[in-house]
């Protein structure tokens, strides 16, 4: 008995498509081995038609594919534009056709129902619009025009030119009679329902001279598109419902076990709380199409999703829909990273953001999710160095540690910084991730002076106190600019025995600027790191003024416990629409913080550390 399983019998009609799902035991070997669909010939050999390795035979070209779902232990063979020639015996299997695990499938393609001669076939998705064309002769031009639906042996009047409308079609059907000379009338049916499916008869005139035309209307439920995404990653549902509903409210919903559809998000402002912080409904284009992005995918996000349009912002029969079946792969390529990062008021956070390691050159971005309306995610910082003005001096995006992860550091935290942030790149959109920043009770671990005024030409010393728990960390000072934070050169003061025992007086790393120049004005960060992994930071703003009195300026370590003064910046930056998430290059026109120029003038700046384990906190 083969462990591979699927439908033994599949029957369909010409022109239609089938989607054949084959199940296999999801062992590690099975998940990664070749999957195939082959046709059994008279000789007993099974000729491959499509495989998971990308092979598609010539008579399947452009109409078939095979998709493996290793997480579920299934693969799906889709075959479109079926013809009678496709009838036959097939196998779906794993490994090699002749001796792998396989399952026999019989496919029968029939001609479909016999239709009256000259029948026009209309195939339309549910919720869409159909226009049935009905020709007539000149002598029937002044006579009554009508459309009937054939139900069994009877014909039921649907609409006629005397203003009759069948109640089942109320408010969604119209009969159009053109001007003189045009011998055709049309019946337009909007918001098609599954129950509209069937054979129709157009009629002009009556008696033996009447004109008749048959129309076969096939109303199809949309086949769900199979979407397979990684745990912790991102999915985008692109929804194009047509111009007819361009100005109607849009929604995305998820089908529940009762076969109703729970709204996930809609354009009327409704959003499921389970998607808080990780969903955006991107604004519509002129054609009414829109997209919904969900990040931080969880296993429980799996299911059938429908997008649609209706004035109520939820699913209603007879309105256009699109469908997806979302599978979430637990064997994710996206590494685990904290979904919640905690910081204290006045302190800092360092957020690790994953990206596709194959796209190391991609531009990296960090944005703040805002839940108002359909959601927005204005960019705060990007790897090219653009930073929103109100984050000047306290936000930096670093390429480290690299190889699939970048770091975002935000300091001078306030309760206003609590919220959801997205990591993204201009490359693989499936690697968008969400992190929530929470502000908790506590004190910052690193202490720097609140603000410092340096005197031109003199020496400035800024102390940074750190607790014993950071004794093994590398300490550094850097000068912030909108392109990053340039580590300052260090000056080794030699070993300090006192530090080995974590002496109270030795937990200090100092920045020395000598002599102070105009270019030294700006933000400086004191921080700790382990290798390429960044820890806490503290920021201090250095203002430079003209010399008033002689002598060097030294900021006493005793003053360093003062909470840093919060620098209030103009926050009137132009809103960035979340549409730009689709193509982050759209952010290029954003107002940027001016580059602060000279990166602290090289050797004039030095970092003194009383730690024996470090080289003055410099970053190599």
């Amino acid at each position: 008995k083969s462990p591979v399983f699927g439908p033994q019998e599949v029957s369909s009609v010409e022109g239609n498509s089938v989607s054949i799902k084959c199940y296999y035991p999801p062992t590690s070997v099975n998940r990664h081995t070749r999957k195939y669909w082959c046709r059994k010939g008279a000789s007993g050999r099974c000729i491959t038609l499509v495989s998971s390795e990308g092979y598609v035979s010539s008579n399947y070209a452009g109409r078939a594919n095979l998709t493996n779902f290793p997480e579920n232990g299934t693969f799906v063979v889709n075959i479109a534009q079926l013809s009678r020639d496709d009838s036959g015996h097939y196998k779906c299997g794993l490994g090699i056709n002749s001796r792998g695990l396989s399952f026999d499938v019989s496919l029968e393609v029939s001609q479909g129902p016999e239709l009256p001669n000259g029948t026009e076939v209309y195939t339309v998705d549910v919720g869409r619009t159909v226009t049935i064309k009905c020709p007539f002769k000149t002598e029937n031009a002044p006579k009554t025009k009508a459309l009937y639906k054939k139900i069994g042996q009877t014909s039921v009047l649907v609409i006629d030119s005397r203003n009759y409308v069948n109640p089942n079609y109320k408010d969604r059907i119209r009969l159009r009679i053109p001007g003189t000379g045009q011998l055709i009338f049309t019946v337009v049916i909007d918001r098609l329902r599954l129950s509209d499916h069937g054979l129709y008869l157009c009629q002009a005139g009556d008696g033996s001279n009447r004109d008749e035309k048959n129309a076969d209307l096939q109303v199809l439920e949309p086949e769900p598109e199979l979407v397979y995404e990684d745990l912790r990653g991102s999915v985008t549902f692109h929804c194009a419902l047509g111009l007819e509903v361009a100005n109607v409210a849009k929604f995305l919903c998820r089908v529940n076990s009762r076969e109703t559809c729970d709204v996930v998000i809609n354009t009327l402002g409704k959003r499921d709380s389970a998607f808080e912080g990780r969903i955006l409904l991107n604004p519509q284009d002129k054609d009414g199409s829109f997209s919904v992005v969900i990040t931080g995918l969880r296993k429980e996000d799996e299911g059938r999703y429908l997008c649609g349009a209706h004035s109520d912002g939820q699913l209603q029969e007879g309105w256009p829909i699109q469908a997806w079946q979302l599978f979430v792969n637990e064997e994710s390529t996206i590494p685990r990273s904290p979904t919640v990062v905690k910081g204290v008021a006045g302190g800092s956070v360092a957020v690790l953001c994953p990206y596709n390691p194959k796209e190391s050159q991609s531009l990296k971005y960090w944005c703040l999710w805002e839940g108002a309306q359909n959601g927005r995610c204005p960019l705060l910082v990007e790897s090219q160095g653009l930073v929103q003005e109100q984050y000047e001096g306290r936000l930096s995006l670093l390429q480290e540690p690299g190889n699939g992860t970048f770091t975002v550091i935000l300091n001078q935290l306030t309760t206003q910084d609590a919220g959801f942030y997205w990591c993204l790149t201009n490359g693989d959109t499936r690697w968008r991730t969400t992190v929530e920043i929470k502000i908790i009770e506590g004190e910052p671990n690193l202490k720097v002076p609140g603000n410092v005024t340096a005197v031109l030409g003199e020496t400035l010393n800024i102390p940074c106190h750190f607790p014993c728990k950071f004794s093994s960390y590398e300490k550094y000072w850097c000068k912030w600019s909108n392109t990053g934070c340039q580590t300052l050169p260090s000056q080794d003061e030699g070993p300090s025995e006192a530090f080995v025992n974590c002496d109270e007086n030795s937990r200090l790393v100092s920045l020395t600027l000598n002599p102070v120049t105009r270019a030294d004005e700006g933000w400086y960060w004191c921080g700790v790191k382990q290798g390429h992994f960044y820890g806490e930071t503290a920021a201090v703003y250095v203002a430079v003024e003209e010399k008033k009195v002689a002598g060097s300026r030294y900021v006493s370590p005793a003053k360093a416990d003062a909470a840093p003064d919060e620098k209030v910046l103009d926050s009137g930056v132009r809103e960035i629409e979340n549409k730009a998430i689709q193509d982050p290059r759209l952010f290029a026109e954003e107002k940027v913080v001016a580059d602060t120029g000279d990166q602290a003038g090289g050797s004039r700046a030095s970092v003194d550390s009383s730690s024996s384990e470090e080289q003055g906190g410099s970053s190599k």
Epitope: P7, E9, N16, V18, S19, G112, L194, Q218, E221, S257
Partner: nanobody, 127 residues
């Protein structure tokens, strides 16, 4: 409210035939996957056959033990599911259940995939 009602069970001789029916109401029959399972006392429910529709295509699934002897069919107009059983064997004796899976995406053979169940109909095959 979803209701599945089985009928057609009974006592037959080995090699006889029997047709089971299941009347479904309250669910989108044509866009659901419908299955037949059976259970003997003290054992788990086991998969017998299933049928699914998509557009104008039909998919039929059978357990190896009934393949070639049982035929599953459905009438979308009447919302009924049938199981034609031929060449019955004593080991086919069980309570037969009709099941519906409107979501259509779990493993067709797994009872947990199906949200709705009938009350069952007894089939007894004597030798």
């Amino acid at each position: 409210e979803v209701q599945l009602v089985e009928s057609g069970g009974g006592v037959v001789q080995a090699e006889d035939s029997l047709r089971l029916s299941c009347a479904a109401s309250g669910l989108p029959f044509s866009s659901s996957r419908m299955g037949w399972f059976r259970q003997v006392p003290g054992k788990e429910r086991e998969f017998v056959a299933a049928i699914g529709w998509s557009g104008r295509s039909t998919y039929r699934y059978y357990d190896d033990s009934v393949k070639g002897r049982f035929t599953v069919s459905g009438d979308n107009a009447k919302n009924t599911l049938d199981l034609q059983m031929k060449g019955l064997k004593p080991e086919d004796t069980a309570v037969y259940y009709c099941a519906a899976d409107p979501n259509y995406y779990g493993d067709v053979r797994t009872s947990g995939t199906y949200q709705y169940w009938g009350q069952g109909t007894q089939v007894t095959v004597s030798s």
